[in-house]
Interface confidence: low
């Protein structure tokens, strides 16, 4: 059981108060983290509270302002980037969000040597992406879907691509589906380590069907938003990878990197690019049927000025029980010999572990092993490998940082974080300086988050970067709910759950239960992290018990659990939520007449199917922006888990797993359906079809739409949403307002 800071600091019961919905909507109890912006082995930049950009040198203990808040304010800058030669800073303003990662902005270049903005050959606006070379101060940027290069900020630009066209050809930036489901970035260009070459992707969306939806705005006529968006089974983007020599860009122009023959024989994806040296690059490709991935190491041929990808440097990763990788196929971390690498993939027992590949995948040396999973490789140096895993004390929802000494024989393993602040900190990430001379640890909980700086050689803590003292003080008089993380063993399946209990929880009493579900493939909801959010309020003030359950399909507990849902979405995820509810009822403190379920996105899909399961367990439930049929969702994501919606593949389950097919079963539950009309991700179409099916079945339900809101339902919509859902649940549970 994890006891959250509650009455620890103050025993006087009457000075304590419950959380309010207003606390949550105002972000009163939000926390801060500190991620250094490393610029060398021992220096980092940080934006101070008063918006100065400050350079810190760990070894001298000195700090100085490299850019004043006055300069930042002069162009309304909200972000910055220092050139590696430290001569220039780009300042970013006029931020305009596009999709999850992408945005456009205006960029100004500030010359630190003379304290003035660079005049002449200014950058066009708005720019879709801009970055410095890793060495010096070359600039690459994307404007109107074309890539441009500047040797120096004041120079005229060299145009690298010319075929860029809105919604048709994307150079150096991903299209919608690659951004959301494959790269998870706003960029698709990569500098070589010393800035000699620039690699970039070209996405051709010419043949992709377009999703169109109305954006109502304030005008007399709504605008139509058009996005090339391949749904399951539709035509996909065609991707090509090019590399250009940035020293002499006009000499031979961009050179295409060949696709491995076994990949090119049918539809495929590019999944990531990793530079090894200035003249060696590693590309990862994936078949459209996403159980085969190929890692291809390519070398620059000086004589031909081309890139050669020999078959002997192709490494195949294949899954026979599911899809390749976890959520994404893992990326390699190369060692100092510039040919061997470390990579996370499934071992023979079906657990994701670190392997060392020197020649072939078949001869890979397994570095970690056990009935737990390695999750991320942070850094490989000459003598150490730093990674995170959930090994410690067998809690899958924890993350600790480990160091393996690869310089000594046999290699030894040390947990860097396990015993640092054991009660407070069980879920870490890390950020390393060059050569791992120093690193920052960011602890997310279960106690109040804290960020610390450490020596990369000794692991000694140097200083606290952020400890959220104000938050700690603010929480002293708050009755926070109790949280416990435990597991259920059902039919050889382990179901981990997090239960959030009212502050004065009494096992002899009966409480309404709310299940919060996400449940998507390779997700994890039961994590040892700190949060004061809507469900904290529901437990603290409204006396509800809230439970989160990680069922089949969820991550970091081995392939058996993960791949159980392969080609069968919407079955086991729902079953496992229902099984857990039955187990919770058996615990004796749940009022079985007052059980609800809610979820967002994939969670909205699962909550809808659970409500329509015909079990009679749920009195009511909420689906926010749910998927309703996998035929409506993005090809890259959907087909990874479901295959194709064709008769000779998996069409039957596509049809059987829709929410609409279960419309009749909503008759005996109270259902609240919510969606943003401008959702570019899970299209409003999904909820429109649920509503239509319910109307056609003459089933009563409640609904709320949010005009011009996307999948995140942000801004004032957030307040309206949570207020509305609170009223719905309180009414369902017969709680007075």
């Amino acid at each position: 059981i994890v006891l959250r800071p509650s009455r620890v600091h103050n025993s006087e019961e009457n000075t304590m108060r419950a959380l309010t919905l207003k606390d949550i909507l105002n972000g009163t109890f939000s926390y801060k983290t500190f991620f250094p912006n490393w610029i060398s082995g021992q220096e980092y930049l940080h934006q101070s509270a008063d918006n100065n950009i400050v350079l810190y040198n760990i070894e001298t203990g000195q700090s100085y302002t490299i850019l004043s808040n006055r300069t930042m304010k002069s162009v309304n800058a909200s972000n910055y980037g220092l050139s590696p030669d430290r001569q220039f800073v780009y300042l970013e303003s006029d931020y305009s969000k596009l999709w999850r990662y992408s945005y456009t902005a205006t960029y100004y270049i500030y010359d630190l040597s003379n304290g003035e903005f660079v005049r002449g050959n200014e950058l066009p606006r708005p720019i879709q992406y801009l970055c410095w070379s890793p060495v010096g101060s070359k600039l690459a940027y994307v404007y109107q879907n074309n890539i441009y290069l500047k040797q120096r900020p004041g120079d005229p630009p060299f145009q690298i691509t010319f075929n860029g066209r809105e919604n048709k050809i994307f150079n150096g930036i991903p299209d919608w589906v690659y951004e959301e489901e494959m790269l998870a970035t706003k960029y698709a260009l990569w500098w070589s380590p010393n800035g000699k070459f620039l690699a970039y992707a070209e996405f051709n969306d010419t043949d992709i069907p377009v999703i169109a939806y109305s954006y109502y705005g304030d005008e007399q006529y709504p605008r139509t938003i058009n996005i090339p968006y391949p749904k399951a089974g539709a035509k996909n983007p065609v991707v090509r990878i090019f590399i250009i020599d940035t020293t002499y860009p006009a000499y031979v122009g961009p050179q295409e990197v060949p696709v491995p023959a076994m990949i090119a024989s049918s539809d495929y994806y590019f999944s990531w690019l990793t530079w090894v040296t200035d003249e060696r690059v590693c590309l990862q490709w994936l078949k459209r049927v996403q159980n085969v991935s190929v890692l291809s190491i390519c070398d620059f041929r000086e004589d031909w000025q081309t890139w050669d990808c020999p078959k002997t440097q192709e490494h195949i990763e294949e899954s026979r029980t599911g899809w390749a990788g976890g959520f994404f196929v893992s990326t390699p971390v190369f060692s100092y010999d510039a040919i061997s690498y470390y990579k996370i993939f499934s071992d023979k027992d079906g657990y994701k572990h670190i392997h060392y590949i020197k020649d072939t995948v078949e001869n890979a040396i397994q570095i970690t092993s056990g009935k737990w999973e390695a999750i991320n490789i942070f850094r490989v140096t000459q003598d150490s490998l730093f990674y995170s895993s959930n090994e410690f004390e067998e809690y899958p929802g924890r993350r600790n940082i480990y160091r393996i000494s690869i310089g000594s024989y046999p290699p030894s393993k040390k947990c860097v974080t396990c015993h640092l602040r054991k009660e407070r900190c069980q879920y870490y990430t890390a950020s390393f300086s060059d050569y791992a001379k120093y690193y920052a640890l960011v602890c997310y909980g279960p106690g109040i988050p804290i960020s610390t700086l450490h020596d990369g050689r000794t692991d000694q803590e140097i200083k606290i970067l952020e400890e959220n003292k104000e938050l700690e003080n603010a929480l002293k008089n708050i009755q926070l709910p109790k949280e416990e993380i435990k597991k259920l063993e059902v039919d050889e399946i382990t179901l981990w759950y997090k239960m959030i209990l009212p502050p004065q929880f009494d096992r002899s009493k009966k409480y309404p239960l709310l299940i919060q579900v996400y449940g998507g493939p390779c997700s994890q909801s039961v994590r040892s992290v700190f949060a004061v959010n809507w469900i904290s309020y529901l437990a603290s003030k409204e006396g509800m018990v809230i439970a989160l359950v990680d069922g089949r399909g969820t991550a970091f507990q081995g392939d058996k659990l993960l791949y159980a849902v392969y080609r069968k979405l919407g079955v086991y995820e729902v079953e496992d939520q229902i099984t857990a509810v039955r187990k919770f009822i058996e615990m004796g403190f749940i009022d079985e007449k007052r059980i609800a379920i809610w979820g967002w996105s994939y969670g909205g899909y699962v909550s809808s199917l659970a409500l329509a399961s015909g079990t009679g367990l749920f009195k009511c439930g909420i689906a926010v922006a749910p998927v309703s049929s996998w035929e409506y969702y993005a090809s890259v994501y959907t087909e990874r888990f479901m295959g194709l919606p064709t008769k000779d593949d998996n069409l039957e389950h596509y049809k059987n797993s829709t929410v609409m097919a279960r419309a009749e079963y909503f008759r005996n539950v109270d259902y609240l359906l919510i969606h943003g009309t401008a959702d570019d991700n899970v299209h409003f179409q999904n909820s429109a079809q649920i509503a239509k099916a319910l109307v056609n079945a003459q089933v009563d339900f409640q609904a709320m739409w949010y005009s011009d809101q996307n999948h995140g339902l942000s801004g004032l919509s957030t307040n309206h949403l949570y207020t509305h859902m609170t009223h719905f649940l309180k009414q369902c549970f017969s709680l007075s307002d």
């Epitope: 043949d207 069907p209 089974g233 539709a234 049918s266 064709t646 008769k647 593949d649």
Partner: nanobody, 130 residues
Framework: EVQLVESGGGLVQPGGSLRLSCAAS????????MGWFRQAPGKGRELVAA????????YYPDSVEGRFTISRDNAKRMVYLQMNSLRAEDTAVYYC???????????????????????WGQGTQVTVSS
């Protein structure tokens, strides 16, 4: 339920014309290449026309090129085969087929294509005879 229903077959004199229609239901019509195959008595199925999804690229084998025209109407979920200058060797059962779209049309080799096609209709008889 997936259905492909052909119509428009019949008896026609050499040199004459026929227009075959195929009504599709039960799947996402726009995502599929559509094809017309034929099978003469004692022979294998052969592809006579194909039209891709989205970009309507057409394909014909040399034996029908210039005489047959395939078209589709995505809104009506229909695919058509206009057959002109018919010959006795065009006599066969004509099948409408839906093929999960790759960038190429269905394989010209009917037997190979049979394995990769999504759906088949029941067929309509075309007889060219004087």
């Amino acid at each position: 339920e997936v259905q492909l229903v052909e119509s428009g077959g019949g008896l026609v004199q050499p040199g004459g014309s026929l227009r075959l229609s195929c009504a599709a239901s039960g799947f996402i019509f726009g995502y599929y290449s559509m094809g017309w195959f034929r099978q003469a008595p004692g022979k294998g199925r052969e592809l006579v026309a194909a039209i891709s999804s989205f970009d309507d690229i057409t394909y014909y084998p040399d034996s029908v090129e210039g005489r047959f025209t395939i078209s589709r109407d995505n809104a009506k979920r229909m695919v058509y085969l206009q057959m002109n200058s018919l010959r006795a060797e065009d006599t066969a059962v004509y099948y409408c087929a839906a093929h999960y779209n790759r960038y190429a049309p269905p394989a010209a080799d009917g037997n190979t294509a049979l394995g990769t096609l999504g759906y088949w209709g029941q067929g309509t008889q075309v007889t060219v005879s004087s």
